[in-house]
C-alpha cells in the first residue's frame, strides 16, 4: 500500500490584490481516511483557511469536486486577495481519531506573496 504524500507543487505564488489565487494540493492515496484542511502558518497560532469537513469559508472554493469518492485534488481558490492574505499556506491531511482527528501529514507549503501590479 502506497504511503500517502501531500503534493504542493508551487513553493512561491505571486498574486495580485483583488484577484483570485489558486493554491494547489493533491494527495497520492485515499488512505488513511480523514479530512484535509488548509492552514496559513504553522504551530498553535496557525489560521484555518479551509476545512473539508465543516465550516463556512466565503472566500474559498474548491477546484475539484470534493464529494467524489475517489477525489485526490484538494486545491482551493481564494478570491479578492488583500495584502493581509500573504503568508505560507499548508495543505494538511488528518487521520480520523477519537475524540479528535490527528494530524497525519502536511504538504511542504506554498508561500503567497504580492506581485507587482500590472502597469
Amino acid at each position: 500500500e502506497e504511503e500517502l504524500q501531500m503534493i504542493q507543487p508551487e513553493k512561491l505564488l505571486l498574486v495580485t490584490v483583488g484577484k483570485t489565487a489558486t493554491l494547489h494540493c493533491t494527495v497520492t492515496s485515499l488512505l488513511p481516511v480523514g479530512p484535509v484542511l488548509w492552514f496559513r502558518g504553522v504551530g498553535p497560532g496557525r489560521e484555518l483557511i479551509y476545512n473539508q469537513k465543516e465550516g463556512h469559508f466565503p472566500r474559498v472554493t474548491t477546484v475539484s469536486d470534493l464529494t467524489k469518492r475517489n477525489n485526490m485534488d484538494f486545491s482551493i481558490r481564494i478570491s479578492s486577495i488583500t495584502p493581509a492574505d500573504v503568508g505560507t499556506y499548508y495543505c494538511v491531511k488528518f487521520r480520523k481519531g477519537s475524540p479528535e482527528n490527528v494530524e497525519f501529514k502536511s504538504g511542504p507549503g506554498t508561500e503567497m506573496a504580492l506581485g507587482a501590479k500590472p502597469s
Epitope: 485515499l30 488512505l31 481516511v33 469536486d65 470534493l66 464529494t67 467524489k68 469518492r69 487521520r95
Partner: antibody
Framework: DVQLVESGGGVVRPGESLRLSCAVS????????MSWVRQAPGKGLEWVSG???????YYVDSVKGRFTISRDNSKNTLYLQVNSLTAEDTAIYYC???????????WGLGTLVTVSS | ALTQPASVSADLGETVKITCSGG??????YGWYQQKSPGSAPVTVI????ERPSDIPSRFSGSASGSTATLTITGVRVEDEAIYYC???????????FGAGTTLTVL
C-alpha cells in the same frame, strides 16, 4: 428543514423498468453527494448507488449495468433509473444525503418497488 | 461484511452498547441508523464514528477503535426500542456497507 421525498415506485413485471425520483428541499442540493439505499421485505439495508455533486457515479456490483443514478441540480432532484428488474429488486428504495465522508445524515420516507409476474 | 449482534435487551434506564465489527478503522468511517419498524424511514443517530446530528438526544454516542465500532445509549428509554444498523464507508472500495441490524428491546 431538510426534506427528501421519493416517488416513482410501483408494481412491475420482471424485465420492466421504472424511474425513481427524490425531490429535496431545505439545503443546497448541488453541494452534496447523494445515495440510494434499498430494503427488501424482512431484510436489512443495502446501499445501491451514489452520485457526487458533480455527477460522478458509483454502484453496488449487483446493479451495475442495470441501474443508472443521475441528478438535476436545477430541479433539486435525484433519480434512479432501474431497468431489467427482477424479483430480487423488490424493496423500499430510500434516497439519502451523504455527509462529507460518504455516510448518511438524512433519509427520505422511501418508495416501494414490487417486481412480480 | 459488518457483524453486529442480532438482538440486545436492556432494562429501562440502563446503559446499552451495540457493537459492529469487521472493518478496518484506517479505511472506514462508521455510522449508526435507527429504524423504529421495518419499512419505516431510517434515522441517523451517529455518523463519522462519533458525531451526533443536532436533533438526536445526547444519550446516543458512538466510538470506533481498531476493527470495532460501538453505539452506546446511556439511560435507555422505551422510545429507543428499534432496529439499529451500523454502516460503513470503505475508502478503499468506494462502497457503503451495512450490518444485518440489531434489535434493541427495552425491558
Amino acid at each position: 428543514d431538510v426534506q427528501l421525498v421519493e416517488s416513482g415506485g410501483g408494481v412491475v413485471r420482471p424485465g420492466e423498468s421504472l424511474r425513481l425520483s427524490c425531490a429535496v428541499s431545505g439545503f443546497r442540493f448541488s453541494s452534496y453527494a447523494m445515495s440510494w439505499v434499498r430494503q427488501a421485505p424482512g431484510k436489512g439495508l443495502e446501499w445501491v448507488s451514489g452520485i457526487s455533486s458533480g455527477g460522478d457515479t458509483y454502484y453496488v456490483d449487483s446493479v451495475k449495468g442495470r441501474f443508472t443514478i443521475s441528478r438535476d441540480n436545477s430541479k433539486n432532484t435525484l433519480y434512479l433509473q432501474v431497468n431489467s428488474l427482477t424479483a430480487e429488486d423488490t424493496a423500499i428504495y430510500y434516497c439519502a444525503r451523504e455527509t462529507w465522508n460518504h455516510l448518511f445524515d438524512y433519509w427520505g420516507l422511501g418508495t416501494l418497488v414490487t417486481v412480480s409476474s | 461484511a459488518l457483524t453486529q449482534p442480532a438482538s440486545v435487551s436492556a432494562d429501562l434506564g440502563e446503559t446499552v452498547k451495540i457493537t459492529c465489527s469487521g472493518g478496518d478503522s484506517s479505511s472506514h468511517y462508521y455510522g449508526w441508523y435507527q429504524q423504529k419498524s421495518p419499512g419505516s424511514a431510517p434515522v441517523t443517530v451517529i455518523y463519522s464514528d462519533d458525531e451526533r446530528p443536532s436533533d438526536i438526544p445526547s444519550r446516543f454516542s458512538g466510538s470506533a477503535s481498531g476493527s470495532t465500532a460501538t453505539l452506546t445509549i446511556t439511560g435507555v428509554r422505551v422510545e429507543d426500542e428499534a432496529i439499529y444498523y451500523c454502516g460503513a464507508y470503505d475508502g478503499s472500495t468506494y462502497a457503503n456497507t451495512f450490518g444485518a441490524g440489531t434489535t434493541l428491546t427495552v425491558l
